[in-house]
Interface confidence: low
C-alpha cells in the first residue's frame, strides 16, 4: 500500500494510527477505509492532542524523516466548486466521514479563495522544534496530490477508527507478555485502552519455553456500554512475586496470603468488579450512565441520579441521552438555517454574506469590489452573483470564466481582415504587405511601392505613416504570428502561398521563403536586412491599421 503503521493511540472510543509514506489524500483515505476507518478528524483541542501524540510516536521511530517541515493528511477536504467561507472555523472544508462543522480549527495561515480545484488539509509539523503537547500541529491546505504526484512534502497520514467501547488493558500479576490485535489489523503490546473486538494473547513466564503458559481473550460487550475480557483474577500470577510484581495486577489493593497467594481489593467507596482485578466507584454516577453529553447529577444521599443536558439539547425517552433541539424549525434565519449540535447558525446563499438589519440577515457580496474581483478584466456585480467581461480584442476563457484570452483576429471566423499579411497582437492586430508593397493609409490594403528584396513589411514605422501610395494589391495572403511554447506571440508572420495572379507582382526572392503550395509557411528574415516589425521575438510595432473589434461580455463568472 506504500504506507506502514508505525504508531497507535487509543483513547475514549477511538484509536488513531499514524502512517508514513508518500500517498495522495485519496490513496491515504482508501488505506484508512480498507481497515474500517477514515482519515482522522481533529474536531477539538483534545482530539488534536491525541493526534499529535500518535504523530510523536511515529516521528520517534521514523529515522527517514530529515525534512524540517513534515505534513500528514487528515480528513478535512473541500470539493471542487465549493468556495471558501471565511466566517466558518473550517472555512467551508468538511470532514470526510461527514458530520457538522466543528468549532475547533488551527489554520497555519490565512486561506486564499480558490474554488477551481479540490483542496485537502494536512497537519504541518515543524520537526526542528521539540514536539511539545502544548504546540499542536497547524493545519495546512493545498492540492490533494495524485497517485503519480502525491506531493513531495507529504510524509504520511493519520487514520481514525471509532468503536462502541474499549476494554482496560489486561493486568499481569507476574512476568509475561500481552499482545493485542485490533480490528484495524494493528498489533501492540501497550495500549492505554483496547478497542472492542480486539484479541489479546498472553504468554506467561520469563521466557523459558517450558514454563510458558498462553491465554487468549477477546474484548467483548458484556452489557450495554460495559466491555471486558471475560477473565477473572490477575494473569500470570506467581507465588515467587506475590503482590510485588505490578501490584499483583490489581487495580487498587493487593492482599497477600501466607502461602504466596494473593487477592485484589478495593478502597472504601469502591467495589471489586467481576474480573476480580478492577475497582469501580459505588457512586452511581461513576459508571457514567448518562450519554450524549448529559451530566450525571447525584440524588439525595448519593443513592440515585438524574441526567441533565446542556443548553440546546433535551433528554430523550430513555432519560439517559441528550438529543439536539432543532432550532431551525422556528425559521430564525433570512436565507439558510443549519442546525448544529446544541445550537444553530445562519448561512447565506452563495453570493451573499452575513450583514444587514436583524439577526441572520444576508446582503449581496460585491465580488467586483476593489481588491477582491475574481475577473481578469471587466467585472459586473449582480444580486447574488457577478459576471466577467473582456476588453475589445479579448474573449472570456478559463475554467471558471474569469480569465480573458486574446482573440486571434488573423484567423477569425470572418476570414482574413487584411489584404495581405496579418499580425496578431495582444488585444488587437496589424496588417502588413509583401515585399515591394506598402500599407495604404487605411491600414488594411497594400499599394505598390518601390521594388525591394526585403522581407514582408510590417506595420509602417512612425515616420513612414501615410507616405505610401500606389495601386492596391488584391487580397492575397494572411499571416498571423506563430505561437511560442507558452502561447506567447512571436512576431514572425505566417502566410499561405498567395495566388500568383498577373497583378500581384512578387519577386523571386520572397518566393524562396514561402512554404510549398497549400501548407503554412514561416517568413524568415534574411540576416542582412535591418530588423523590421516582423523580426525577432518582439511584437509588431503599432501602425495606423484599422482594428477589428469584438465586444465580449455577458458570460457569468463562477462564484
Amino acid at each position: 500500500t506504500g504506507a506502514d503503521t508505525e504508531a497507535v493511540v487509543c483513547v475514549g472510543t477511538a484509536c488513531y494510527t499514524a502512517h508514513s509514506g508518500k500517498l495522495s489524500a485519496a490513496e491515504a483515505q482508501n488505506h484508512c477505509n480498507q481497515n474500517g476507518g477514515n482519515l482522522a478528524t481533529v474536531k477539538s483541542k483534545e482530539e488534536a492532542q491525541h493526534v499529535q501524540r500518535v504523530l510523536a510516536q511515529l516521528l520517534r521511530r521514523e529515522a527517514a524523516l530529515t525534512a524540517r517541515m513534515s505534513k500528514f493528511w487528515i480528513g478535512l477536504q473541500r470539493e471542487k466548486g465549493k468556495c471558501l467561507d471565511p466566517s466558518l472555523p473550517l472555512k467551508g472544508f468538511s470532514w470526510v466521514g461527514g458530520g457538522e462543522d466543528t468549532p475547533y480549527s488551527n489554520w497555519h495561515k490565512e486561506l486564499r479563495n480558490s474554488c477551481i480545484s479540490k483542496r485537502c488539509v494536512s497537519l504541518l509539523l515543524d520537526l526542528s522544534q521539540p514536539l511539545l503537547p502544548s504546540r499542536l500541529p497547524k493545519w495546512s491546505e493545498g492540492p490533494c496530490g495524485s497517485p503519480g504526484s502525491p506531493g513531495s512534502n507529504i510524509e504520511g497520514f493519520v487514520c481514525k477508527f471509532s468503536f462502541k467501547g474499549m476494554c482496560r488493558p489486561l493486568a499481569l500479576g507476574g512476568p509475561g507478555q500481552v499482545t493485542y490485535t485490533t480490528p484495524f489489523q494493528t498489533t501492540s503490546s501497550s495500549l492505554e485502552a483496547v478497542p472492542f473486538a480486539s484479541a489479546a494473547n498472553v504468554a506467561c513466564g520469563e521466557g523459558d519455553k517450558d514454563e510458558t503458559q498462553s491465554h487468549y481473550f477477546l474484548c467483548k460487550e458484556k452489557a450495554p456500554d460495559v466491555f471486558d475480557w471475560g477473565s477473572s483474577g490477575p494473569l500470570c500470577v506467581s507465588p515467587k512475586y506475590g503482590c510485588n510484581f505490578n501490584n499483583g495486577g490489581c487495580h487498587q489493593d493487593c492482599f497477600e496470603g501466607g502461602d504466596g497467594s494473593f487477592l485484589c481489593g478495593c478502597r472504601p467507596g469502591f467495589r471489586l468488579l467481576d474480573d476480580l482485578v478492577t475497582c469501580a466507584s459505588r457512586n452511581p454516577c461513576s459508571s457514567s450512565p448518562c450519554r450524549g453529553g448529559a451530566t450525571c447529577v447525584l440524588g439525595p444521599h448519593g443513592k440515585n441520579y438524574t441526567c441533565r443536558c446542556p443548553q440546546g439539547y433535551q433528554l430523550d425517552s430513555s432519560q439517559l441521552d441528550c438529543v439536539d433541539v432543532d432550532e431551525c424549525q422556528d425559521s430564525p434565519c433570512a436565507q439558510e438555517c443549519v442546525n448544529t449540535p446544541g445550537g444553530f447558525r445562519c448561512e447565506c446563499w452563495v453570493g451573499y454574506e452575513p450583514g444587514g438589519p436583524g439577526e441572520g440577515a444576508c446582503q449581496d457580496v460585491d465580488e467586483c469590489a476593489l481588491g477582491r474581483s475574481p475577473c481578469a478584466q471587466g467585472c459586473t456585480n449582480t444580486d447574488g452573483s457577478f459576471h466577467c467581461s473582456c476588453e475589445e480584442g479579448y474573449v472570456l476563457a478559463g475554467e471558471d470564466g474569469t480569465q480573458c484570452q486574446d482573440v486571434d483576429e488573423c484567423v477569425g471566423p470572418g476570414g482574413p481582415l487584411c489584404d495581405s499579411l496579418c499580425f496578431n497582437t495582444q488585444g488587437s492586430f496589424h496588417c502588413g504587405c509583401l515585399p515591394g508593397w506598402v500599407l495604404a493609409p487605411n491600414g488594411v490594403s497594400c499599394t505598390m511601392g518601390p521594388v525591394s528584396l526585403g522581407p514582408p513589411s510590417g506595420p509602417p514605422d512612425e515616420e513612414d505613416k501615410g507616405e505610401k501610395e500606389g495601386s492596391t494589391v488584391p487580397r492575397a495572403a494572411t499571416a498571423s504570428p506563430t505561437r511560442g511554447p507558452e502561447g506567447t506571440p512571436k512576431a514572425t508572420p505566417t502566410t499561405s502561398r498567395p495566388s500568383l495572379s498577373s497583378d500581384a507582382p512578387i519577386t523571386s526572392a520572397p518566393l524562396k521563403m514561402l512554404a510549398p503550395s497549400g501548407s503554412p509557411g514561416v517568413w524568415r528574415e534574411p540576416s542582412i536586412h535591418h530588423a523590421t516589425a516582423a523580426s525577432g521575438p518582439q511584437e509588431p510595432a503599432g501602425g495606423d491599421s484599422s482594428v477589428a473589434t469584438q465586444n465580449n461580455d455577458g458570460t457569468d463568472g463562477q462564484k
Epitope: E46, Q49, R53, A56, Q57, R60, N106, Q129, P130, L132, P133, S134, R135, L136, S190, E192
Partner: antibody
Framework: QVQLVQSGAEVRKPGASVKVSCKAS????????MHWVRQAPGQGLEWVGE????????YYNQKFKGRVTITADKSTSTAYMELSSLRSEDTDVYYC?????????????WGQGTTVTVSS | DIVMTQSPDSLAVSLGERATINCKAS??????????LNWYQQKPGQPPKLLIY???NLESGVPDRFSGSGSGTDFTLTISSLQAEDVAVYYC?????????FGGGTKVEIK
C-alpha cells in the same frame, strides 16, 4: 494519596555513574510524564529531562544529552535517572516530578529529592 | 533557551503586607492564547510545591492570598497578605519550549 518516593543519597567518584529511582503510587503511572530536575546547594532549579512511561519516549535538556538516561518500569511504576561521567559540579539534589500529559506541563507532584555527591 | 529573570532576588515584607515578585522571560511563553508559566514555592529542606499554573490558575489546596498575572514575557506573583508560613524561595518556570527553564528564585522573608 499521590506520592513519589526517591531512593537514598549517593556518593560517587568523578567519572563514575549514578542511577536514582523514583517510585510512583496513588495514580496511574502511565498517564503522566515523569521529569527530573536538579538543584545545586543554595542554587536554582534546572530541568534535566522527561519520560512518557506509557511508551518510554524521552526528551532531554541538550546540556545533559549523552550523559543522562531516563527510563521507566511500568510493572513497578518506577522511573530512573542515570547520570554518567560524573563531575564535581554534578553534586546536586535530584528531584523527580510528574506532569500532566498534555498542554502546560507544570510539575504538580514532586519526590522528596536524592542528594548525589561527587567527590574524589 | 528561554532565560527567566526574577526580581528582586530577595524581599522583606511585614506580616499582613503585600509581596510582589516579578518574572521576565527572554521571549514570549504564550501559545494559542495560554501562558505557559508556572510558580513554585520551596521551603528549606523540601521539594518545590506548585502554587500557580498557566500564569494565573491557583493549584488546588493553595491559599487564595496567592495570585498570578501577566502574559507574553512579563509575569507577577502576588501574596496579598504575607503569613509566617509563606517564608520561602519562589521560582517561576516556563513550559512553552524545551528545555523547561526556571527563574533564579526570589527569597521572601519577614521584615
Amino acid at each position: 494519596q499521590v506520592q513519589l518516593v526517591q531512593s537514598g543519597a549517593e556518593v560517587r567518584k568523578p567519572g563514575a555513574s549514578v542511577k536514582v529511582s523514583c517510585k510512583a503510587s496513588g495514580y496511574t503511572f502511565t498517564s503522566y510524564w515523569m521529569h527530573w530536575v536538579r538543584q545545586a546547594p543554595g542554587q536554582g532549579l534546572e530541568w534535566v529531562g522527561e519520560i512518557d512511561p506509557s511508551a518510554s519516549y524521552t526528551y532531554y535538556n541538550q546540556k545533559f544529552k549523552g550523559r543522562v538516561t531516563i527510563t521507566a518500569d511500568k510493572s513497578t511504576s518506577t522511573a530512573y535517572m542515570e547520570l554518567s561521567s560524573l563531575r564535581s559540579e554534578d553534586t546536586d539534589v535530584y528531584y523527580c516530578a510528574r506532569s500532566v500529559y498534555y498542554g502546560n506541563k507544570y510539575f504538580d507532584v514532586w519526590g522528596q529529592g536524592t542528594t548525589v555527591t561527587v567527590s574524589s | 533557551d528561554i532565560v527567566m529573570t526574577q526580581s528582586p532576588d530577595s524581599l522583606a515584607v511585614s506580616l499582613g503586607e503585600r509581596a510582589t515578585i516579578n518574572c521576565k522571560a527572554s521571549q514570549s511563553v504564550d501559545y494559542a492564547g495560554d501562558s505557559y508559566l508556572n510558580w513554585y514555592q520551596q521551603k528549606p529542606g523540601q521539594p518545590p510545591k506548585l502554587l500557580i499554573y498557566a500564569a494565573s490558575n491557583l493549584e488546588s489546596g493553595v491559599p487564595d492570598r496567592f495570585s498570578g498575572s501577566g502574559s507574553g514575557t512579563d509575569f507577577t506573583l502576588t501574596i496579598s497578605s504575607l503569613q509566617a508560613e509563606d517564608v520561602a524561595v519562589y521560582y517561576c518556570q516556563q513550559t512553552n519550549e524545551d528545555p523547561r527553564t526556571f527563574g533564579g528564585g526570589t527569597k521572601v522573608e519577614i521584615k
